[in-house]
């Protein structure tokens, strides 16, 4: 495939990545699948600078990111290492809270109204952000 050199229509370019901000809500798994179908992934936050960029675009709205611990350890969807990476949890989070009564704890991370992160029930229909890197091989065939 060819290398993607500019962002698709309706995506926002920032620091050699492209971002798409939803205006509707989906469960985390559905949001994850949506991004994958776009040859992208749920946003992976690797720096304070990227955090501020995303925060600016989403506003004070609960929004899924590409971080979950559904299999035990916290994992970023693109394989970025959680342990050594950037973190911006709210105080006392993540708490894997069971008190919601919906079954299970809280296994998916989202931006809260102040931008800091919280873990929540993955089935909640929050907005989401997709990210794809420029210069990575595109799935589309090259133009001849």
């Amino acid at each position: 495939g060819s290398e993607r050199t500019c962002c698709p229509v309706n995506w926002v370019e920032h620091e050699r990545s492209c971002y798409w901000f939803s205006r509707s809500g989906k469960a985390w798994a559905d949001a994850d699948n949506y991004c994958r179908l776009e040859d992208a992934h749920l946003v992976v936050v690797t720096s304070w600078e990227e955090q501020k960029f995303v925060q600016h675009h989403i506003g004070p709205v609960n929004t899924w990111m590409g971080l979950h611990d559904q299999n035990g350890p916290w994992k970023w969807v693109d394989g970025t290492d959680y342990e050594t990476g950037f973190k911006n949890w709210r105080p006392e989070q993540p708490d894997d809270w069971y008190g919601h009564g919906l079954g299970g704890g809280e296994d998916c991370a989202h931006f809260t109204d102040d931008g800091r992160w919280n873990d929540d029930v993955c089935q909640r229909p929050y907005r989401w952000v997709c990210e794809t890197e420029l210069d990575k091989a595109s799935q589309e065939p090259p133009l001849l």
Epitope: D69, N71, G72, W74, P91, E92, P94, D95, D96, G103
Partner: antibody, heavy 112, light 107 residues
Framework: EVQLVESGGGLVKPGGSLRLSCAAS????????MNWFRQAPGKGLEWVSS????????YYADSVKGRFTISRDNAENSLYLQMNSLRAEDTAVYYC?????WGQGTLVTVSS | DIQMTQSPSSLSASVGDRVTITCRAS??????LAWFQQKPGKAPKSLIS???SLQSGVPSKFSGSGSGTEFTLTISSLQPEDFATYYC?????????FGGGTKVEIK
Amino acid sequence: EVQLVESGGGLVKPGGSLRLSCAASGFTFSSYRMNWFRQAPGKGLEWVSSISGSSTDIYYADSVKGRFTISRDNAENSLYLQMNSLRAEDTAVYYCARRDFWGQGTLVTVSS
Amino acid sequence: DIQMTQSPSSLSASVGDRVTITCRASQAINTYLAWFQQKPGKAPKSLISAASSLQSGVPSKFSGSGSGTEFTLTISSLQPEDFATYYCQQYYSYPLTFGGGTKVEIK
């Protein structure tokens, strides 16, 4: 590499107390709910207690409620289980565990 | 409390056999189910979480399926190192509960 190392087990008389410790390493301890499980000799697995990363959400099995206290020190990457009013039926190997990873366990024997 | 019923409690099988262990929950638990393997004198080892997600480093001969109240663990081709006791555990709600275990022995 994720590691959980329990300590503090031993022989104690009925009615006595014991404090188990679990030293965690290789992961961001404060990001994880932690549990204590136990296994009596020749028996199956039993959950004992659970504590959220910030200690705000705690649960106990009915069999230990009012006698055992779970706590953690995120600065020290440590999990604790204070066991009071011990009974013979508390005799077991006690395991410290994250959802996906268990320590090797420490044996607690309650006998006169 | 949610009761977890595992069957069989023990089974004898030969190397190369396909083995299936069943776990039934007393109420629906979605896919909040884990499978553990335990060998004598050792700590339980996590094999599968969320009913079907293989833990990192666990060989693909292990697979899990199910949702709601019925779950299965399958070992596609039993190897000598697989002879152990297997437990299911629900983490849908507290108290966390386990099945009684299935001891897989050499025939």
